[in-house]
């Protein structure tokens, strides 16, 4: 009889442990859901406020046609500049036409004057070809003037109304570019 009671007691204790475990899992699951919900709500509110503002470009970015441009206020080497742009959901500036080049140089004149700004152009070490960061070649009128005699990697930058080249490890301002949001109205 005592053995029977002892067995029942052990079974009850086992059941209690399982229930505690289930409760712990549920609490953990609930906490995880709450965190996800918080993230979703914040993300939705962010998206809604962006949509409400319905500006094609973020604050402090300049718009021209389908593009938004950000002119940095800090110096960095070319690779860090690329990294900074990616963090903003953009890439270093890729100049597709003379019209775009004129817009950029005109805007820079108004904002900061004659400084150096990295763009998304680099020279292939083996072939010596200039390539934009998406792998495309610049149009013939948008090739940097040969100015760098560097043995290191060479990258492109804008100064005044010219495209020039320099050792990628030198410090310059930089320009990021992203697509402007299309209005669905």
């Amino acid at each position: 009889k005592l053995l029977q009671v002892s067995t029942i007691a052990m079974q009850q204790q086992e059941k209690l442990i399982q229930q505690e475990r289930a409760l712990l899992n549920f609490t953990e699951w609930k906490r995880s859901c709450a965190l996800q919900m918080k993230y979703c709500q914040a993300f939705m509110q962010n998206s809604l406020s962006s949509a409400h503002n319905s500006s094609p470009c973020p604050n402090n970015w300049i718009q021209n046609r389908e593009s938004c441009y950000y002119v940095s206020e800090i110096w960095s080497i070319w690779h860090t500049s690329q990294e900074n742009c990616l963090k903003e959901g953009s890439t270093l500036l890729q100049i597709e036409s003379k019209e775009e080049m004129d817009f950029i140089t005109g805007s820079l004149r108004k904002i900061k004057g004659s400084y150096d700004y990295w763009v998304g152009l680099s020279q292939d070490g083996h072939s010596g070809r200039w390539l934009w960061q998406d792998g495309s070649s610049p149009s013939p009128g948008l090739l940097p003037a040969e100015r760098s005699q560097s043995a290191n990697q060479v990258c492109g930058y804008v100064k005044s109304n010219s495209l020039l080249s320099s050792n990628c490890s030198t410090w310059k301002y930089f320009i990021c570019e992203k697509y402007a949001l299309r209005s669905s109205v």
Partner: nanobody
Framework: QVQLQESGGGLVQPGGSLRLSCAAS????????MGWYRQAPGKQRELVAA???????AYGTSVMGRFTISRDNAKNTVYLQMDSLKPEDTAVYYC???????????????WGQGTQVTVSS
């Protein structure tokens, strides 16, 4: 916490191809950019390729014309197609996600565990 699950690494002969995949546990659009970085022994981690949520692409200079980055939004997955592989492409390849800030709070990058790519005959 975001999980980035990489796959597709391995041993391949020079001139061969590999395709890496990186599946994220969260929607692609909650990131400003996703991409691949690599680190060879004794070297710094370098950008291989990245794609922004707007679809802009950036490649590392040494892989241009050989590697192609793409994404599948429905699967929250980013791919790296690596062709014409060279011994100097040997490295650990890491998937990376740059989170879009929520309410101005900045979060550091998310990284995968890394997948080894060895190019050797």
């Amino acid at each position: 916490q975001v999980q980035l699950q990489e796959s597709g690494g391995g041993l391949v002969q020079p001139g061969g191809s590999l395709r890496l995949s990186c599946a994220a546990s969260r929607s692609f659009f909650s990131f400003n950019a996703m991409g691949w970085y690599r680190q060879a022994p004794g070297k710094q981690r370098e950008l291989v390729a990245a794609i922004t949520n707007g679809g802009r692409i950036a490649y590392g200079t040494s892989v241009m014309g050989r590697f192609t980055i793409s994404r599948d939004n429905a699967k929250n997955t980013v791919y790296l197609q690596m062709d014409s592989l060279k011994p100097e492409d040997t490295a650990v390849y890491y998937c990376n996600a740059k989170p879009a800030p929520v309410y101005g709070s900045t979060v550091g990058d998310y990284w995968g565990q890394g997948t080894q790519v060895t190019v050797s005959s």
